[in-house]
Interface confidence: medium
């Protein structure tokens, strides 16, 4: 069966300066390929986190994605700013040249509240 990307929260609210967790789990690790988080959709979407060796300031993975059986690809955004507001999508790719997007979560909207 086709892999599903599940983002159970429709939205989260976080105060500026605090941290928030955006949850994402997969039903399978197959087909082989990376998982990436984006803010927004379409051509203008912004890469927020990739479960690879890249370093993303303020964004970390919640559980150890290097473990073979791990299906949790949640992220934590620290020191949230008003500019972090938007809808975040957890996206599964199939490895290739280039990688192909095969499934996206339903999106989680982040609301940033004034401190």
């Amino acid at each position: 069966t086709e892999v599903k990307v599940i983002q159970p929260e429709k939205s989260v609210s976080v105060a500026a300066g605090d941290s928030t967790v955006l949850n994402c789990t997969l039903t399978s690790l197959l087909p082989v390929g990376p998982i990436r988080w984006y803010r927004g959709v379409g051509q203008s979407r912004q890469l927020i986190y990739s479960f690879t060796t890249e370093h993303f300031p303020r964004v970390t993975n919640v559980s150890d994605a290097t473990k073979r059986s791990n299906l949790d690809f949640s992220i934590r955004i620290s020191n949230v700013t008003p500019e972090d507001a938007g809808t975040y999508y957890c996206v599964k790719f199939q490895r290739g040249s280039p990688d192909t997007e095969i499934q996206s979560g339903g999106g989680t909207e982040v609301y940033v509240l004034a401190k």
């Epitope: 599940i6 159970p8 929260e9 429709k10 339903g106």
Partner: antibody, heavy 119, light 108 residues
């Protein structure tokens, strides 16, 4: 107080159409995703359809896909369900249900409207 | 699609007794599970969300527990108004949203 009032139910023949309405009050209607859930006589609850607050995102149960159309008019605080090509198995009480703002559970329901499809 | 199985189908008890209702999911839904009460001629009512959080105005004799695939709704001491049908619903997976088949709690 949140209120959801369904209307438009009735008795129709197989193949005919019906449009259900749900008038909402007591909350900012356009900010919430809305659903239709039905219950056939003597049966359990069955989710039918979902529409996002803006109307941009829509889902249907496989059993009604291609026959039912969900819509909303945020200026009138009203949710609709257009039901075409009705079948006997669509006979049920149809409930309008408001979703929680963060998760897809239903924090308020209407009393329902009965749709009977019979020849 | 996540299938929810409720048991028993019917629970026959006396007022003051403890009711234990079960809901089993075909795959993990973590704690993304809600319970509803339905009475004839009334709108269904949200009782529990997040597997264990009581909705506003719900008496504390109602409690929910469980995570993953096994969930329980407990009514500590049945009152006359608690005799009704109870449904669980998962909201972990994106639509289709699924309900259990229901458990009827009836008076002995």
């Amino acid at each position: 107080d949140v209120q959801l009032v369904e209307s438009g139910g009735g008795v129709v023949r197989p193949g005919e159409s019906l449009r259900l309405s749900c008038a909402a009050s007591g909350f900012t209607f356009s900010s919430y995703d809305m659903n239709w859930v039905r219950q056939a006589p003597g049966e359990g609850l069955e989710w039918v359809s979902l529409i996002s607050g803006s109307g941009e995102i829509i889902y249907y149960a496989d059993s009604v896909k291609g026959r039912f159309t969900i819509s909303r008019d945020n200026s009138k605080n009203t949710l609709y369900l257009q039901m075409n090509s009705l079948r006997a198995e669509d006979t049920a009480v149809y409930y309008c249900a408001k979703e929680n703002n963060r998760y897809r559970f239903f924090d308020y329901w209407g009393l329902g409207t009965l749709v009977t499809v019979s020849s | 699609e996540t299938v929810l199985t409720q048991s028993p189908g019917t629970l026959t008890l006396s007022p003051g007794e403890r009711a234990t209702l079960s809901c089993r999911a075909s795959q993990s839904v973590y704690t993304y599970l809600a319970w509803y009460q339905e009475k004839p001629g009334q709108a269904p009512r949200l009782l529990i969300y997040g597997a264990s959080s009581r909705a506003t105005g719900v008496p504390d004799r109602f409690s929910g527990s469980g995570s993953g695939t096994e969930f329980t709704l407990t009514i500590s001491s049945l009152q006359s108004e608690d005799f009704a049908v109870y449904y669980c619903q998962q909201y972990y997976d994106r639509p289709p949203l699924t309900f259990g088949g229901g458990t009827k709690v009836e008076i002995k």
